[in-house]
């Protein structure tokens, strides 16, 4: 008779592959199998009990032969029902069945807790066929058991669309307590009560808990897991852990630090990212948060001019992204800037103050009181104005830009003149007679060209007209002035 032995790395319903060095004996007795793998497991449970067939696992296939011979009932032999062992030990267990060859096509598989075992499990199936019966022993071994190996294992054989199921083999892995919930680090308010939780499981049960604060036990008597420790309040940082004890020994949880919330440290490294005439973009590095998240920050801005009244502008912003654009500042001005941030406990001190300056900008207003009149004798237009207020020049005046537009009979022509900063009058040549001249003036700094004044119009008559009068910037709300001479 043939003896087949095989090992499978992955247990499939069909028995994959031969076990290295197939057994060459004609027929090895069913219950005295050699360990084909060559290693002696820590625990070996063989189906040595003779095992009456038990009806729960018996399959009596419905199909009969062409001669109507019923197929005999099949059942797995009884084996050990419960295995208790320590974590990291090895275990080997098996199920066995003798299948008459007349069944001709069977598959076998291992299942754990209702799920087929298809992973990298170490299963060995050995076949011992003779003329009438094939003895099958399916062994399952775990070299170093873990808690996750706990459960109910069964063999299933599929034969003629029937399923035969072995008795379950319960594996119970015992070891040191295993934490399912450990205390967590916390940040707490000074002198305020808080809770810590610790939970551990066996087997074996029960599991008892001791609490430890700064290396000293808190409770004299152990508490059954799970345990909640109520701490009435702390005035300084402390480290807590818990010890879980069972019959196998003790396991210590991680130590967790309980911090006391405090006001934050002041921000550091306040720096200028960008300056314009009227805004400054700053950034800062937040200080230590005092074990409580930052809520918002305050930017304090003082004019650095010793002659200023020393008032402080305050701008509030969110704590993130450690960046703020300070607006509504004066051009060409110096400022001192500090930052302070707050958490639920309170405000930090102000950061070290830094100096920052705004740049020169274009004037924000146009020249005032623009007047225009015709000097007919010299065929010129005279323009006069007043410079914008110093505060609104936003820089050092470098001059003025004069726009004069000449319109006559549907033709329009714009000319631009530049005037030095000292003047407050200009003279432009008449470009076209019998035309309207529209004049606008803008102040200019290195920061740019400011807004143009409202237009002032003057009519330039044909040669020979005598009378003339000046035109000037209208009072607000009046229509554009046009003087006909």
């Amino acid at each position: 008779a043939i003896t087949e032995a095989r090992e499978e790395a992955k247990p499939y319903p069909l028995f994959p592959g031969p076990f290295p060095g197939s057994l060459q004996t004609d027929h090895t007795p069913l219950l005295s199998l050699p360990h084909a793998s060559g290693y002696q497991p820590a625990l070996m449970f063989s189906p040595t009990q003779p095992g009456r067939p038990h009806t729960g696992n018996v399959a009596i296939p419905q199909v009969t032969s062409v001669e109507s011979k019923p197929l005999p009932p099949l059942a797995f032999k009884h084996t050990v029902g419960h295995i208790i062992l320590s974590e990291h030990k090895g275990v080997k267990f098996n199920c066995s069945i003798s299948v008459p060859n007349i069944y001709q096509d069977t598959t076998i598989s291992w299942w754990k807790d209702g799920k087929e075992l298809l992973g990298a499990h170490h299963a060995i199936t050995q076949f011992y066929p003779d003329d009438e019966v094939t003895a099958i022993i399916a062994s399952f071994s775990i070299t170093s058991v873990q808690r996750s190996d706990n459960g109910s294992y069964i063999c299933k054989m599929k034969i003629n669309n029937e399923e035969i199921v072995s008795d379950p083999i319960y594996i119970e892995v015992q070891g040191l307590p295993h934490f399912t919930k450990q205390p967590e680090s916390m940040n707490v308010t000074r002198n305020t009560a808080f809770n810590l939780t610790c939970q551990a499981v066996g087997p074996p049960e029960p599991v008892n808990i001791f609490w430890v604060q700064n290396s000293s036990r808190v409770n004299e008597q152990p508490e059954k897991s799970p345990s909640v420790l109520t701490v009435p309040g702390l005035t300084e940082m402390a480290v807590f852990s818990c010890e879980a004890h069972n019959d196998k020994g003790l396991t210590v949880s991680k130590g967790v630090q309980i911090n006391i919330k405090a006001i934050p440290s002041p921000p550091t490294e306040v720096s200028i990212r960008n300056s314009t005439a009227h805004s400054i973009l700053i950034s800062w590095v937040p200080g230590f948060d005092g074990y409580s998240p930052f809520r918002n920050c305050s930017i304090q801005v003082k004019e650095a001019d010793p002659l200023s009244n020393g008032s402080v502008m305050i701008f509030n912003t969110s704590a993130l992204p450690h960046l703020y654009q300070i607006k509504q500042l004066q051009a060409l001005a110096n400022y001192s800037i500090g930052v302070s941030c707050m958490n639920e406990i309170g405000w930090s001190a102000v950061s070290p103050w830094i100096l920052a300056s705004t740049t020169e900008g274009a004037p924000s207003v146009a020249p005032l009181n623009v007047t225009v009149f015709l000097n007919e004798s010299s065929d010129n237009v005279d323009i006069r104005w007043m410079k914008p207020p110093t505060k609104q020049q936003d820089g050092e005046l470098v001059g003025y830009r004069i726009s004069h537009v000449w319109q006559s009979a549907g033709i329009s022509k714009e000319l631009l003149e530049e005037v030095g900063q000292n003047g407050s009058r200009a003279r432009i040549s008449v470009q076209v007679h019998n035309a309207t001249c529209t004049v606008r003036i803008a102040a200019v700094t290195r920061g740019g060209v400011g807004p143009f004044s409202d237009p002032v119009k003057i009519f330039i008559p044909a040669h020979g007209w005598v009378d003339y009068a000046p035109s000037s910037t209208p009072a607000p709300g009046n229509a554009d002035p046009v003087l006909i001479i």
Partner: antibody, heavy 120, light 107 residues
Framework: QVQLVQSGAEVKKPGASVKVSCKAS????????MNWVRQAPGQGLEWMGW????????TYADDFKGRVTMTLDTSTSTAYMELRSLRSDDMAVYYC?????????????WGQGTTVTVSS | DIQMTQSPSFLSASVGDRVTITCKAS??????VTWYQQKPGKAPKLLIY???TRHTGVPDRFSGSGSGTDFTLTISSLQPEDFATYYC?????????FGQGTKLEIK
């Protein structure tokens, strides 16, 4: 010794049927399933199905369902395979092959093959 | 259905050479793979089953390996009688399927 002896070559017309026999000897016929495998000229092997020689229950490959019938005569330890509605692409050598063991689906003993020619 | 893809389809080698034929399954078949040898005009002969167990009487120059989806048949030192066509077959599940064959020819 264990052997499978098949019937002789057949020449059939398209649309006809062919029945190939396979006589087993040297072992208990009803303990081993019988498979049928064919091989077209110059081609590979194609599994057609198998029959449980104890129960007489056949299992057919989808490509042959409705055209093939596998039967037994246990008194003479003979298995039969009948293929109907023959087409030119059924021209092949047909083998019977013994299923090795109750837990294995490979073939340890083969018949010598029966050549079936389909020609009008 | 599980497809079995053999490579190469043709292989030229000399007596004494070591040759390897591979077979790839379209899905995991464990080690439920067998190899056959077929000579012209003859029925196939079983060489290897369970991916690596030699059938009775098969010379030890034939060896098989692999599991899951990748399998190989190795002939360590070719003999004149080894020139033939070789087929793999999976028997993880029905329908049983074969590779398309590798024809081993004398160089």
């Amino acid at each position: 010794q264990v052997q499978l002896v098949q019937s002789g070559a057949e020449v059939k017309k398209p649309g006809a049927s062919v029945k190939v026999s396979c006589k087993a000897s040297g072992y208990t016929f009803t303990n081993y399933g019988m498979n049928w495998v064919r091989q077209a000229p110059g081609q590979g092997l194609e599994w057609m199905g198998w029959i449980n020689t104890y129960t007489g229950e056949p299992t057919y490959a989808d490509d042959f369902k409705g055209r093939v019938t596998m039967t037994l005569d246990t008194s003479t330890s003979t298995a039969y395979m009948e293929l109907r509605s023959l087409r030119s692409d059924d021209m092949a050598v047909y083998y019977c092959a013994r299923k090795s063991t109750v837990v294995s689906r490979y073939f340890d003993v083969w018949g010598q093959g029966t050549t079936v020619t389909v020609s009008s | 259905d599980i497809q079995m893809t053999q490579s190469p389809s043709f292989l030229s080698a000399s007596v004494g050479d070591r040759v390897t034929i591979t077979c790839k399954a379209s899905q995991d078949v464990g080690d439920a793979v067998t190899w056959y040898q077929q000579k012209p005009g003859k029925a196939p002969k079983l060489l290897i089953y369970w991916a690596s167990t030699r059938h009775t009487g098969v010379p030890d120059r034939f060896s098989g390996s692999g599991s899951g989806t990748d399998f190989t048949l190795t002939i360590s030192s070719l003999q004149p009688e080894d020139f033939a066509t070789y087929y793999c077959q999976q028997y993880r599940s029905y329908p049983l399927t074969f590779g398309q064959g590798t024809k081993l020819e004398i160089k």
